[in-house]
Amino acid sequence: MAFAPIPRITWEHREVHLVQFHEPDIYNYSALLLSEDKDTLYIGAREAVFAVNALNISEKQHEVYWKVSEDKKAKCAEKGKSKQTECLNYIRVLQPLSATSLYVCGTNAFQPACDHLNLTSFKFLGKNEDGKGRCPFDPAHSYTSVMVDGELYSGTSYNFLGSEPIISRNSSHSPLRTEYAIPWLNEPSFVFADVIRKSPDSPDGEDDRVYFFFTEVSVEYEFVFRVLIPRIARVCKGDQGGLRTLQKKWTSFLKARLICSRPDSGLVFNVLRDVFVLRSPGLKVPVFYALFTPQLNNVGLSAVCAYNLSTAEEVFSHGKYMQSTTVEQSHTKWVRYNGPVPKPRPGACIDSEARAANYTSSLNLPDKTLQFVKDHPLMDDSVTPIDNRPRLIKKDVNYTQIVVDRTQALDGTVYDVMFVSTDRGALHKAISLEHAVHIIEETQLFQDFEPVQTLLLSSKKGNRFVYAGSNSGVVQAPLAFCGKHGTCEDCVLARDPYCAWSPPTATCVALHQTESPSRGLIQEMSGDASVCPDKSKGSYRQHFFKHGGTAELKCSQKSNLARVFWKFQNGVLKAESPKYGLMGRKNLLIFNLSEGDSGVYQCLSEERVKNKTVFQVVAKHVLEVKVVPKPVVAPTLSVVQTEGSRIATKVLVASTQGSSPPTPAVQATSSGAITLPPKPAPTGTSCEPKIVINTVPQLHSEKTMYLKSSDNR
């Protein structure tokens, strides 16, 4: 599998409609929780929780502050922590507790605390519960949590130093935690947790499971340096701990290695960054998407692997265990365990078979089973990705978060659309197209290029958004910017499953937001733009320039995958000649204008889509070069003497026949650099005039012209 290509389109922050929320002097907007039924997005930040309108996040509905007392700050600072940054209250847990309350935990100046937030009054109840084991002490430490039936399952560190990792369940009747032992958790960096419900009609009466994803230091591989390993672990919701062995500890904690590698090149992605569990009506078993980077990531590599949950379940239910053996100098080595496995199976959830054997609860499990799972929490079998390869590998980018949406294209094909954020504040939207990856677009969410810390996807039909949280605020973006594709070709070439061309309205529309039937809409995920109706009209601009000047003709082609070239009187221009230059890889510069330069200039783009080449006429300009006699009297029109060598620009209406382009002979260089001739004349542009004072009085007029063209593909 090759590296993913560059995004086809790059949307700058100001180019697209993004809604933003931020409060001055509030930072670290890293906890997001969406209540779809209330159309409310809850935002946990440093020292504050906000409720905003999920359809327009700039509308704040409620706010509550949870600040650290000066006394607590001082005590924290005495322990060597920063009073200005670390000794504050970073909200780290924001989970639904009931229809009217949220469970909120914060680092609270290295004294983690939890409270209940009443959603009616939007005030904390003042419970001030000890947050140890539920929330990290240090805002820099990793954490994850999920609320399951009113009980909080967390993965975090249990002490001030962050040296004691813990996966726990906060429960009034049955609190549980992991053993503090290297085989269980070895310096983990927690990434994600979620509950997977067993289907009610499950024949084996199985339990719900809570999955944890993290990266930890390997125990099974020995190298000179610490090898990091991505893990999937799971516990059973019904676990009540053991009676004697593993008392108040998990009896169902098992973990396995997640594989995400490129077999052909030996590229191994072993640092887990984020996980998204995709649930969809069409999926019998959830699929989870995991985002990785390699341990030694000096080139900025990122990968996404997708896994069937059933693969993980198979490893935990039937896989082999690993065992530690002591070799010389009391050195521990981990190997596959091939001995007898006690019954009931260690780490298994209590199912119908166990109940039939009178093991109705983990408290009834025999010591042999419990001792075995205590000593063998690690599986020998690994969890492998779908198709045994990554869905996406991208170079020169550090991805931070992922969300995935399953959507249906017009032809009925189902696509998993991956929204992946970067450490530079951008969002990539990618799909798999016939074993290749197509990055539809890149959107700059945060203008300061700051890392995206959290991503959230709304699942409500009709109004679909991605929410991204960073240090400075939250941004709301639609799933697609269909309306930004101005032509049928652009709409089709985008190969965006959310977008289709509507011939009646001549607009690119969002499929999920169109109420009208999809009949007549055009969408070709193959990128075959020949399905587009012929353009009967193509507007062009007419410019008048003075002799000896320089003209700049604009060509706005958004596609990063397209190659731009220019034609003059149907002949392809050589941009590297002394006569012509390219500005910004697309705009044409014509130097030292003479009457021979008058005529029709066309900017064409060539884009390879699969094995086809799609040609488009992006812009057409008619240039007329005139010799302007020097005025006898002093000019009185000095106010318009600001257009360099341009005399006038007209946008006119006419009818001309284009011709299909030959194979282009010249293209814009990737650097976009051009060599200007010595002392070039002032430049005139076709769209925005350059401000250059000139001695020749100039008049300005505009008119619109349309072309019938057959060369628009």
Epitope: P24, D25, E47, E63, Q84
Partner: antibody, heavy 118, light 106 residues
């Protein structure tokens, strides 16, 4: 100790512009928003806007858009407010105030008196 | 924008007397903040987030309220408390201040 030192009093003619400075010390200048407040002669306090020194992004009270422009110089930890097209209505004391999470102005400058008179 | 109305505009109190200044908002606000200003000086943050006393503020001061009605209370008036007190909301932009209450000592 946190300090905000504002520039001295200004006497300017109507129609002119003026730039008031606020030099910050004793804290991380780029890490906190800087707010500006106008106190006119009836002692009425009016919030003008804020700027985030980290990226220079500013937000204004609609009433002061076009009147005030907020800028910062990170190298000297100084915030500036330029007021243009001055009229007698702009005569007031102008304060800069360091932001804090959840409230404005845990520290205020000493104020700059602006008098617009012909 | 939210308008804050303070009452009374001017009041005087004897030493040891209990003083209450109220601030009424035209819309619901989450929190109210209070500033103290003495003649010739800049405003000082006095009470933040409705009920938290700023650093150095005597314990005889307290703040309370919710929704559209908030108050600042001095349990026992002292001479040094004579000043103008302003309420401020920042829940809805733009932030707004009350017209001020001038508190004098009898």
């Amino acid at each position: 100790e946190v300090q905000l030192q504002q520039s001295g009093p200004e006497l300017v003619k109507p129609g002119a512009s003026v730039k008031i400075s606020c030099k910050a010390s004793g804290y991380s200048f780029t890490g906190y928003y800087m707010h500006w407040v106008k106190q006119s002669h009836g002692n009425i306090l009016d919030w003008i806007g804020y700027i985030y020194p980290y990226n220079g992004v500013s937000t204004y009270n609609q009433r002061f858009k076009g009147k005030a422009t907020l800028t910062v110089d990170k190298s000297s930890s100084t915030a500036y407010m330029e007021l243009r097209s001055l009229t007698s209505e702009d005569s007031a004391v102008y304060y800069c105030a360091k932001g804090a999470s959840g409230y404005d102005g845990d520290y205020w400058g000493q104020g700059t008196t602006l008098t617009v008179s012909s | 924008q939210i308008v804050l109305t303070q009452s009374p505009a001017i009041m005087s109190a004897s030493p040891g007397e209990k003083v209450t200044i109220t601030c009424s908002a035209t819309s619901v606000v989450s929190y109210m903040h209070w500033f103290q200003q003495k003649p010739g000086t800049s405003p000082k943050l006095w009470i933040y987030l409705t009920s938290n006393l700023a650093s150095g503020v005597p314990a005889r001061f307290s703040g309370s309220g919710s929704g559209t009605s908030y108050s600042l209370t001095i349990s026992r008036m002292e001479a040094e408390d004579a000043a103008t007190y302003y309420c401020q909301q920042r829940s809805s932009y733009p932030p707004t201040f009350g017209g001020g209450t001038k508190l004098e000592i009898k």
